[in-house]
């Protein structure tokens, strides 16, 4: 099990301290309360890279 | 089978403290979330208090926190509720019950209960 | 918080009749809601979770359906074992969780 603070859970889930495990992200559209949640509105979205100066 | 078995309720006066038991049997007790529920005489159902696999994070009902505290020993099977300052409000059968597996959308195994009874 | 109000608070029937309980929430809680059964003196008993799952065990008389704000517990058959009280309970908003007031289903 991970705990908090080690390595990262992986792209598109977030560690939950109520479940003591690693939850998908995509749950959050429909229960949005829940505690890992906040983890995953944490990431800022990808910079814009354009592809010419 | 799944067995969960509930102690340590009593009478005790108005201001006092119990600590209620629950001990788990026929399953691996750690990776389940549990809760405690309580039932005052001829009433509904009362969530009390959540407390996470690993006991590192728990919540309270408003009507008890700052006097009720939840924790577990997963090395010896056993979730506790350490109750102080205990009111008449607070008489009821306290039922602890197991988290499902996957999240805690349901609780599918239940203790007996135990009673506590709060008076002078 | 969620409030659950279920209807109706009693009902009597008899063996065979078909009993519907309702329970509504304050708010949507999508399909987070789970169904318990309690008889006197005993722990509640885990029917129905998610709406409409059927839990392991349990018969296939009962069965829950809604989603949003509105929700059915059916017993297609009512049999002698099933006169008890029944829960619903919300889970959306878990591990902060609430229950319905209860529904008692009494003997004609």
């Known amino acids: 099990e991970q705990a908090p603070g080690t390595a990262p859970c992986s792209h598109g889930s977030s560690w939950s301290a109520d479940l003591d495990k690693c939850m998908d992200c995509a749950s959050c559209r429909a229960r949005p309360h829940s505690d890992f949640c906040l983890g995953c509105s944490a990431a800022p979205p990808a910079p814009f890279r354009l592809l010419w100066p | 089978e799944v067995q969960l078995l509930e102690s340590g309720g009593g009478l005790v006066q108005p201001g006092g403290s119990l600590r209620l038991s629950c001990a788990a049997s026929?399953?691996?007790?750690?990776?389940?979330?549990m809760i405690w529920v309580r039932q005052a005489p001829g009433k509904g159902l009362e969530w009390v208090s959540y407390?996470?696999?690993?006991?590192?994070?728990?919540h309270y009902a408003d009507s008890v926190k700052g006097r009720f505290t939840i924790s577990r020993d997963n090395s010896k099977n056993t979730l506790y509720l350490q109750m102080n300052s205990l009111r008449a409000e607070d008489t009821a059968v306290y039922y602890c019950?197991?988290?499902?597996?996957?999240?805690?959308?349901?609780?599918?195994?239940w203790g007996q209960g135990t009673l506590v009874t709060v008076s002078s | 918080d969620i409030q659950m109000t279920q209807s109706p608070s009693s009902l009597s029937a008899s063996v065979g009749d078909r009993v519907t309980i309702t329970c509504r929430a304050s708010?949507?809680?999508?399909?987070?809601l789970n169904w318990y059964q309690q008889k006197p003196g005993k722990a509640p008993k885990l029917l129905i979770y998610?709406?409409?799952s059927l839990q392991s065990g349990v018969p296939s008389r009962f069965s829950g359906s809604g989603s949003g704000t509105d929700f059915t517990l059916t017993i297609s058959s009512l049999q002698p074992e099933d006169f008890a009280t029944y829960y619903c309970?919300?889970?959306?908003?878990?591990?902060?969780?609430?229950f319905g007031q209860g529904t008692k289903v009494e003997i004609k």
């Open positions: 019950a197991r988290g499902g597996d996957t999240y805690f959308d349901y609780f599918d195994y």
């Open positions: 026929g399953f691996t007790f750690s990776p389940y979330p």
């Open positions: 407390i996470s696999p690993s006991g590192g994070s728990t």
């Open positions: 708010q949507s809680i999508s399909g987070y």
């Open positions: 998610q709406a409409s």
């Open positions: 309970q919300q889970s959306y908003t878990s591990p902060f969780i609430t």
